[in-house]
Each structure stands twice: as C-alpha cells, then as structure tokens.
C-alpha cells in the first residue's frame, strides 16, 4: 500500500507549475468511471502536488487513482511520463531496492509510512541528508542514486531527489530512513510524530 | 485492433536517403509514443529513439544523432524515420514500435528491410 | 547508460523441455523489465512486462520472474512454436536498453 500514492505525487511533482494547471483543468472534464465523482473546482485548483494527490487517492482510490492520473498526463501529451507511472505502479513485491527483503503481502502494514505522511515536512526541514545517504547507501541507494542526490545544490533539493526514489521502496525501506532520521535529527522526528 | 503498418523494403546507394513509413491504427495516435529500433542482419534489437505524438518532440539515442530524423503526419497518424547520406552499415530491418503501457513496446510494425549497396 | 546481458546467448532444447533465460542489468532497474519473443523474419512481440506481467494473449507456459538486476522467462514444456530468440529489455525510461539476445533452436 502507499506505492501507487508516491507514484502518483512523484509524477505530479515533477510537472511545471503550468503543467499541474493543466493537469487540474483536464480532471475537471476527463470522463469518470461510474460511481466516481468528481473533486469539487474550487478545491482542486488551490492544490498544490501533496494535496492534490491525497485528494486524488482519498477520491479514487491508489489503484484508480493511478490509472485516471495516467490517462490525464496522456491527454497532456506527457507520454513517457504516464508510461512511467503505469510502471511504478504496477510493480509487484519483488521490487525492493538493493538487498533489502520486501515483507510478505499479509504483513502489510496499514495506512501511510511516517515518510509519506511527512514527505512535504521532511523535504523542508531535513538539514543532514550527507549523513542519512551515507546510512542508506548500499542498502536501499545504489551508487548512482546515492551520487545523484549528492549532486543536488540544496537541501531540500537534495531531499526532492531522494524523495524520487520512494516508489520503488517497500516499508523495510522507509523503516530504514526513518531510523537514519531518528539518529541524526531526532528533534524533527518527535516534533512531526507529535502533530 | 492495434495495427502498425510500415512501408515496403527499399534499396539505396550509399549517399541517398530513406523515408520509411509506420502508419497506425486501432488507438488514438497522439496518447503513445513511436519508437525506432534497429535490427541489422543477424543482430539483436537496437534502440533508435522516439517521437513524442501530441508534441511532434523527438529524441535520439547516442548512435543515431546526425543523419537521422523521426517525424510525424498526426492527420494521417502515420510516423516517419529518414536516413540522410545512407551508409553500407545502415542495412537493416527498421521497426516502428508503439511506447506504450507501463513504457513497454506493446505494439510492433512487421519491420521494414533497407539495403544500402553500391 | 544501464546495460543488459543475457545468457545463454544460445540455447538448444527439445519439445516437452523446461529452459529458463536469464538476464542481468548493470544496475537496479527494479522489476522493470520486459520479455520479447522474435520469430525468423518477423517482428518481436511483447511477452512480459514489469519483470512478471504476462502480457493477455501469451500461453501461460511463459513466467518472467526477478527484480532489482538478476531477471528470468521460463517456458514450461516447450511448443514448436516457441523456438526463435528472445530479449529482455529496460522499459521504465530512456534508454530503454535490449539485451544481447538469446536463440532458442530446436535440438
């Protein structure tokens, strides 16, 4: 649960402010499977990439979800982009990053991972991302991600980009960034686990 | 169905160039991309690149920047690959292959043979 | 660039036979990966995506299996009409890398 929502936010972060306008422009006309309504306008519009996209999943659900997210990025002409977003969520278990063993389906862990409830936080508030990356790498980041978020000017770009590689990760993964935060920013994990 | 249907095969002297054709049917054109890949005598498949249909945008793989160049009649939902200054070593079978669920190529032209000799 | 390799680059097997076809990519591509089956002097044709997905259509002797960069397609008791050769393939992104190739001959 929770890898069709990261795919879905990772590809609408990824458009260009007037892409995600459009892509809110074509939500409110794309046909809807019956028994589906549609996300108010007035809501939809003053989303941002984080809120439209729990309001997609809350709305359609992850699988549905997807699907109509896809359909909306082909009908904007983003082709590969949707492709890959039929991809990511159409990945079985057996996806888990470099060694790490992905639990049984009965384990399944309800709701959101504490990563994925406080992506927007994390992103904005993470200041030692050399130390989780060194923490992650070998065991959930390969060489050439482990160097393309180090790569990143900033921060929170550097969080972004990490952040990119989420989909594909199973909760053993999160686990395991979430332990690397525990360890080197404590305060911000207590602070998020309290609101 | 989905169909792809390519042009017939074509033989050229080093120099000239090529236009192959890959008209599609049975799907709205626009919403999938149209792949290019390469299959010389006795050789695997090689990737060219693809053009993006609703943008008209193309892109190259390495090997195939310069002398090549991918384009589209939307109206026809046809897409097009040219050679300029044909080689020996541009004889192959060409196939159009449609970018299509999950970025697989999910729908094939029957391939089109181009032999380039003096 | 990811580089995909597949082993054996051929293979002989015999009607009623069980092969497998491995593939290996240069770096974890997860489980995105296809299946392609190319018979003499036709076009390929979409077996498996997203490394175990068997495509509607495809008989199901075929199963793709694996992730991160070790993959396989096993065919179960083997048909006539499963002899040509097959290519694994990335298929998330660019550069939507082939492998070598593997030719599957009749014995």
């Known amino acids: 649960m929770g890898r069709a929502r990261d795919a879905i936010l990772d590809a609408l972060e990824n458009l260009t402010a007037e892409e995600l306008k459009k892509f809110k422009l074509k939500l409110l006309s794309v046909p809807l499977r019956e028994g589906y309504g549609r996300i108010p306008r007035g809501a939809l519009l003053s989303m941002d990439a984080l809120d439209l996209t729990d309001k997609l999943v809350s709305f359609y659900l992850e699988t549905y979800g997807a699907e109509l997210t896809a359909n909306v990025l082909r009908d904007m002409g983003l082709q590969e982009m949707a492709g890959q977003l039929q991809a990511a969520t159409h990945q079985g278990s057996g996806a888990a990053p470099a060694g790490i063993q992905a639990p049984p389906q009965s384990a399944a862990k309800p709701g959101l991972h504490f990563i994925d409830q406080h992506r927007a936080a994390l992103i904005a508030r993470v200041t030692n991302v050399e130390w989780l990356l060194d923490a992650l790498y070998g065991k959930v980041l390969t060489d050439e991600q482990y160097q393309a978020v180090r790569a990143e000017p900033t921060n929170p770009s550097k969080m972004r980009k990490l952040f990119s590689f989420t989909p594909a990760w199973n909760w053993t993964c999160k686990d395991l960034l979430l332990q690397a935060l525990r360890e080197s920013q404590s305060y911000l994990v207590e602070d998020l686990e309290r609101s | 169905q989905i169909q792809l249907v390519q042009s017939g095969p074509e033989l050229k002297k080093p120099g000239e160039t090529v236009k192959i054709s890959c008209k599609a049917s049975?799907?709205?054109?626009?919403?999938?991309?149209m792949n290019w890949v390469k299959q010389a005598p006795g050789k695997g498949l090689k990737r060219m690149g693809w053009?993006?249909?609703?943008?008209?945008?193309?892109t190259y793989s390495d090997d195939f920047k310069g002398r090549f160049a991918f384009s589209l009649e939307t109206s026809a939902s046809t897409a097009y690959l040219q050679i300029n200054n044909l080689k020996n070593d541009d004889t192959a079978t060409y196939f159009c292959?449609?970018?299509?669920?999950?970025?697989?190529?999910?729908?094939w032209g029957q391939g089109t043979t181009l032999t380039v000799s003096s | 660039d990811i580089q995909m390799t597949q082993s054996p680059a051929s293979l002989s097997a015999t009607v009623g036979e069980t092969v497998t076809i491995t593939c290996r990519a240069s770096?974890?591509?997860?489980?995105?990966l296809a299946w392609y089956q190319q018979k003499q002097g036709k076009s390929p044709q979409l077996l498996v995506h997203?490394?175990?997905t068997l495509v509607e259509g495809v008989p199901s002797r075929f199963s793709g299996s694996g992730s991160g960069t070790q993959f396989s397609l096993k065919i179960n008791s083997l048909e006539p009409e499963d002899f040509g050769n097959y290519y694994c393939?990335?298929?998330?992104?660019?550069?939507?890398?082939f492998g070598g190739g593997t030719k599957l001959e009749i014995k």
């Open positions: 292959a449609r970018l299509g669920y999950a970025n697989s190529f999910d729908s």
């Open positions: 049975g799907y709205t054109f626009t919403k999938y991309g």
């Open positions: 053009i993006n249909t609703y943008t008209g945008e193309p």
């Open positions: 770096e974890n591509i997860y489980t995105y």
């Open positions: 997203n490394a175990n």
């Open positions: 393939q990335y298929h998330y992104g660019s550069p939507y890398t």
